[in-house]
């Protein structure tokens, strides 16, 4: 006669986080008398998941009615699976006996892997703004996914980037994993409206990747170009001088007029005009009373943009 066998037909199962996992186990005999217990892991540190004889296991239900005469099905269902539930589960038959149960026979085990979706990718850029032609780094992070296999891609305005480095942690087995990627992006003057996108593809997402974005408008600083011009005489003793501040970003800008090095007027940019590329233009003018000057006047338009050192452009006004 054959001795009781514990049959776990599934070597492995995969379950999505939040769902229920059914772990199958049947025995071939009703003897010896004694309970079935389920454990996660093997050896002295194994974790009790279910005990037929006693205990309260709120997340575990038996698939069959264990009070039914001749029942040999000891499959269990574990509800609300999380990545922490991953592991190998053993169905173990015990033999009734004093003082402690004697382990009689174990099933071969069923490995439960948990499919957990990655969190929405978070893209962060540099702490300080940078100017065109500079290379800046963007990081992308996503957490809590399982299994470990994951694909991450970077895009700038729909064009895939190639200069990036990606790490998935931890390197060894874990209940869930995190991904961290750093991409290098060269800024151009046209990047105010640009977007950097981090795209994460995982088996749990069923072909619909998650995306995180960063707007380069948060990262770029486009310094202005200045042009100072003298307008035709408006009145006999007055000359109108304009300072054209072009193609700058962001808006924060302060302009100071100097007459022969002396501050004449300071103003903060307002009523800006926006260019198609997202940069701004602004114009300031200064009305100079020529009769107040005996000699030629050096007019300087000095601009402080976004807290950066001032840039300036001068114009010599001839007094005849």
């Amino acid at each position: 006669e054959e001795e009781l066998q514990v049959i776990q037909p599934d070597k492995s199962i995969s379950v999505a986080a939040g769902e229920s996992a059914t772990l199958h186990c049947t025995v071939t005999s009703l003897i010896p008398v004694g309970p079935i217990q389920w454990f996660r892991g093997a050896g002295p540190g194994r974790e009790l998941i279910y005990n037929q004889k006693e205990g309260h296991f709120p997340r575990v239900t038996t698939v069959s009615d264990l009070t039914k005469r001749n029942n040999m099905d000891f499959s269990i269902r574990i509800s609300n699976i999380t990545p922490a539930d991953a592991g190998t589960y053993y169905c173990v038959k015990f033999r009734k006996g004093s003082p402690d149960h004697v382990e009689f026979k174990s099933g071969a085990g069923t490995e439960l892997s948990v499919r957990a979706k990655p969190s929405a990718p978070v893209v962060s850029g540099p702490a300080a703004r940078a100017t065109p032609q500079h290379t800046v780094s963007f990081t992308c992070e996503s957490h809590g996914f399982s299994p470990r296999d994951i694909t991450l891609k970077w895009f700038k305005n729909g064009n895939e980037l190639s200069d990036f480095q990606t790490n998935v942690d931890p390197a060894g087995d874990s209940v869930s994993y995190s991904i961290h990627s750093t991409a290098k992006v060269v800024l151009t003057r046209e990047d105010v409206h640009s977007q950097v996108i981090c795209e994460v593809a995982h088996v749990t997402l069923q072909g619909d990747p998650l995306r995180g974005t960063a707007n380069l408008s948060e990262t770029i600083r486009v310094p202005p170009t200045l042009e100072v011009t003298q307008q035709p005489v408006r009145a006999e003793n007055q000359v109108n001088v304009t300072c054209q501040v072009r193609k700058f970003y962001p808006q924060r800008l302060q302009l100071t007029w100097l007459e022969n090095g002396n501050v004449s007027r300071t103003e903060t940019a307002s009523t800006l005009t926006e260019n198609k590329d997202g940069t701004y233009n602004w114009m300031s003018w200064l009305l100079v009373n020529v009769s107040a000057h005996r000699d030629d006047v050096k007019l300087t338009c000095q601009v402080e943009h976004d807290g950066q050192p001032a840039v300036s452009k001068s114009h010599d006004l001839k007094v005849s």
Epitope: E1, E2, E3, L4, T28, S29, L30, I31, P32, V33, G34, P35, Q52, K53, E54, L66, T67, R69, N71, M72, R95, K96, G97, S98, P99
Partner: antibody, heavy 115, light 111 residues
């Protein structure tokens, strides 16, 4: 589905007897067979259970004098050193207790120990 | 070894009566529920009524019910029928697989 006992009868004190319990309608392979006896006018008394291989166990009072065995269709109870107080109707039943209760019983066979 | 005590040893009742039989274990039965009830009529083999303290065996009328846990158990016949006059035995199991002991029985007689 039934169990049919045989082998009972009159035996002298100190003698031996082997009882048989034949199953029809089901196999004994995955079930324990338990033996219970009832002395005339008395209550039921558990003797032991025959499982598979080493899985046989007996009430403390029955150890040594009672041994059981079984095939897929028949269970046996070997009784030795019989005494007058062993006189009883002997029943076999399918099951091994707890969640495997004694659900099918034989009709019983009378064993009389007397000189 | 576990000891099982049934009370009363006999009870007289009429058809239609509610009858309650008790069984007490000297220590907690295995799993707090290793307790079965059997019915035996004269000249017949016992018949399983209840197992695991409260599970009704297949084919047993629903007027029979079992309850209890640990050391104290009850068999209730909600409305006694003529065929229910018999002797009732409890069988309790201790922690050892061979520790299975019948109570002394309760005879239900016609009043």
């Amino acid at each position: 589905r039934q169990l049919v006992e045989s082998g009972g009868g009159l035996v002298q004190p100190g003698g031996s007897l082997r009882l048989s319990c034949a199953a029809s309608g089901f196999s004994l392979s995955s079930h324990g067979i338990s033996w219970v006896r009832q002395a005339p006018g008395k209550g039921l008394e558990y003797i032991g259970t025959i499982g598979t291989g080493v899985i046989t166990y007996y009430a403390s009072w029955a150890k040594g004098r009672f041994t059981g065995s079984k095939t897929s269709s028949t269970a046996y109870l070997q009784m030795t050193s019989l005494r007058a107080e062993d006189t009883a109707v002997y029943y076999c039943a399918r099951g091994s207790a707890w969640n495997d209760p004694f659900d099918y019983w034989g009709q019983g066979t009378l064993v009389t120990v007397s000189s | 070894d576990i000891e099982m005590t049934q009370s009363p040893s006999s009870v007289s009742a009429s058809v239609g009566d509610r009858v309650t039989l008790t069984c007490q274990a000297s220590q907690s039965v295995y799993g707090n529920n290793d307790l079965a009830w059997y019915q035996q009529k004269p000249g017949q083999a016992p018949k399983l009524l209840i197992y695991l303290a409260s599970t009704l065996a297949t084919g047993v009328p629903s007027r029979f019910s079992g309850s209890g846990s640990g050391t104290d158990f009850t068999l209730t016949i909600s409305s006694l029928q003529p065929e229910d006059f018999a002797t009732y035995y409890c069988l309790g199991g201790g922690d050892d697989e061979a520790d299975n002991v019948f109570g002394g029985g309760t005879k239900v007689e016609i009043k």
